[in-house]
């Protein structure tokens, strides 16, 4: 009996850039021969239904019809058939299918591979044009993927230490495309300073589906207006 | 900075068991496989077999098929390698070294070494 | 088994010499245009230390001095100017095949 199995869920994601290694075990009755085996890997676009060959690998010979794109011989003697995909691109998103061939028996499974890419976040001040007293505190997002992404403020006074979600005086602008396919968005929060206590802390939160944790950036307000912190660290996907 | 740090020295008697953890740092564990190497003393090296983490699949020499288990804890970086019914010429230095396995074979990384002593 | 055959068993060269490890196979370790034989270094109460992989292409942070050749059944390690921390014994070992084995080692002295 020869099974293939792919990532439990059946779909893995992955960073942008990264070295992916798109999982496909085999389960053979008998120990596994390299040389009297075929392996092919094929990748269906989300745009078009299209199958194309990713790379082959039969007995004496392998070839990668991607760039870079390999299976390991080492690992495929002890069932491992998962295919590495160098550098990988938003565009090579999709469903991948692993074909393995035993003579006389085939086996096959698909998985869905999603290609994400976390958010910078920066947060700036804005005064030009603004009344006295009155600031506009922009949080800019930058190089996400995919466009889906939720902004929002938060503030922590020393009264009320825990943070309370700001709802009033905040924009948020379009998603921009940029020209590598990822994503751009800018929020904005209008403060009228006077209304404040000073020593209020203002948090920019960002939340991602490649981050693990929301990305935060915060700026206190003190009696000399505001003071801009830098974006505070998070893990981001891996 | 590719760590390998081994479990220190075993002293055993002959016909029991040993083994050996290799904790592994400065990389993703399961894009590599881990090689274990041993050398007796004053001889050469001798491959032992490799453990590819991603999946836990073997690949042993035939001369310690049936005596070694190599295995891996993927949550902790952690390769280890058992070896039962012991004799006195299994005294040897033990290594395990972190192997390239997509684009080439070969062990890049090496741990500090295990000296396991069999006697009686 | 693929046997690996290394000659010298062991070699004295004066400093700033050329040194030259032969190491022969019982059988080729080519596989699809890549041959499989890679050369460490060993000195005294340390690990091995990976110089050459794939033949001929030299892992980071290996001295350019450092070099390897060959295909099929046949291979060379050379190192152009012997400098005195290259004293040490030379393993070549095969991974076309397994078990991968290594070669008996040459013991590189200064003369």
């Known amino acids: 009996d020869l099974k293939v199995e792919m990532m439990a869920g059946g779909t893995q994601i992955t960073p942008l850039n990264d070295n992916v290694t798109i999982f496909c075990n085999i389960f053979y009755s008998q120990p596994l021969n390299i040389t009297s085996m075929g392996i092919t890997w094929f990748w269906k676009s989300l745009t078009f239904d299209k199958e194309v060959k990713v790379f082959e690998f039969f007995g004496d010979h392998q070839e990668a019809f991607r760039p870079g794109a390999i299976v390991s011989p080492w690992r495929l003697k002890s069932g491992d058939a998962s295919l590495r995909l160098p550098g990988i691109q938003l565009e090579e998103a999709g469903e991948y299918r692993c074909e393995v061939v035993v003579t006389p028996l085939k086996a096959q499974g698909t998985v869905q591979l999603e290609v994400v890419a976390s958010p910078a976040s920066r947060l700036l001040l804005d005064q030009v044009g603004m009344k006295e007293n009155e600031d506009k505190y922009m949080c800019e997002s930058s190089g996400f993927y995919p466009e889906a992404i939720n902004i929002t403020w938060e503030k922590q006074t020393q009264k009320f230490p825990h943070p309370i979600e700001i709802s009033e005086d905040v924009i948020t602008g379009p998603t921009i495309k940029n020209m590598d396919g990822t994503f751009n968005v800018t929020s904005c929060l209008k403060l009228n300073s006077s209304q404040e206590d000073p020593g209020t802390v203002y948090q920019c939160v960002v939340r991602h589906a490649s981050l693990h944790t929301p990305l935060r950036s915060n700026f206190t307000l003190t009696a000399a207006r505001h003071s801009l912190s830098e974006t505070e660290k998070t893990d981001n996907f891996s | 900075e590719v760590q390998l740090v081994q479990s220190g020295a075993e002293v055993k008697k002959p016909g029991a068991s040993v083994k050996v953890s290799c904790k592994a740092s400065?990389?993703?564990?399961?894009?590599?496989?881990m090689d274990w190497v041993r050398q007796a003393p004053g001889q050469g090296l001798e491959w032992i077999g490799d453990?590819?983490?991603?999946?836990?699949?073997?690949l042993y020499n035939q001369k310690f098929r049936g005596r070694v288990t190599l295995t891996v804890d993927t949550s902790i970086s952690t390769a280890y390698m058992e070896l039962s019914r012991l004799r006195s010429d299994d005294t040897a230095v033990y290594y395990c070294?972190?192997?390239?396995?997509?684009?080439?074979?070969?062990?890049?990384?090496w741990g500090q070494g295990t000296t396991v002593t069999v006697s009686s | 088994d693929i046997v690996l055959t290394q000659s010298p068993d062991s070699l004295a060269v004066s400093l700033g010499e050329r040194a030259t490890i032969n190491c022969k196979a019982s059988?080729?370790?080519?596989?699809?245009?890549?041959?499989?034989m890679n050369w460490y270094q060993q000195k005294p109460g340390q690990p091995p230390k990976l110089l050459i992989y794939?033949?001929?292409t030299l892992h980071s942070g290996i001295p350019d001095r450092f070099s390897g050749s060959g295909s099929g059944t046949d291979f060379t390690l050379t190192i152009s100017s012997l400098q005195a921390e290259d004293v040490a014994v030379y393993y070549c070992?095969?991974?076309?095949?397994?078990?991968?084995?290594f070669g008996q080692g040459t013991k590189l002295e200064i003369k």
């Open positions: 070294a972190r192997s390239e396995v997509f684009y080439g074979n070969y062990a890049d990384y």
């Open positions: 400065g990389y993703t564990f399961t894009d590599y496989n």
């Open positions: 453990i590819n983490p991603n999946n836990g699949g073997t």
């Open positions: 059988q080729s370790v080519d596989y699809d245009g890549d041959s499989y």
């Open positions: 794939a033949a001929s």
């Open positions: 070992q095969q991974s076309k095949e397994d078990p991968r084995t």
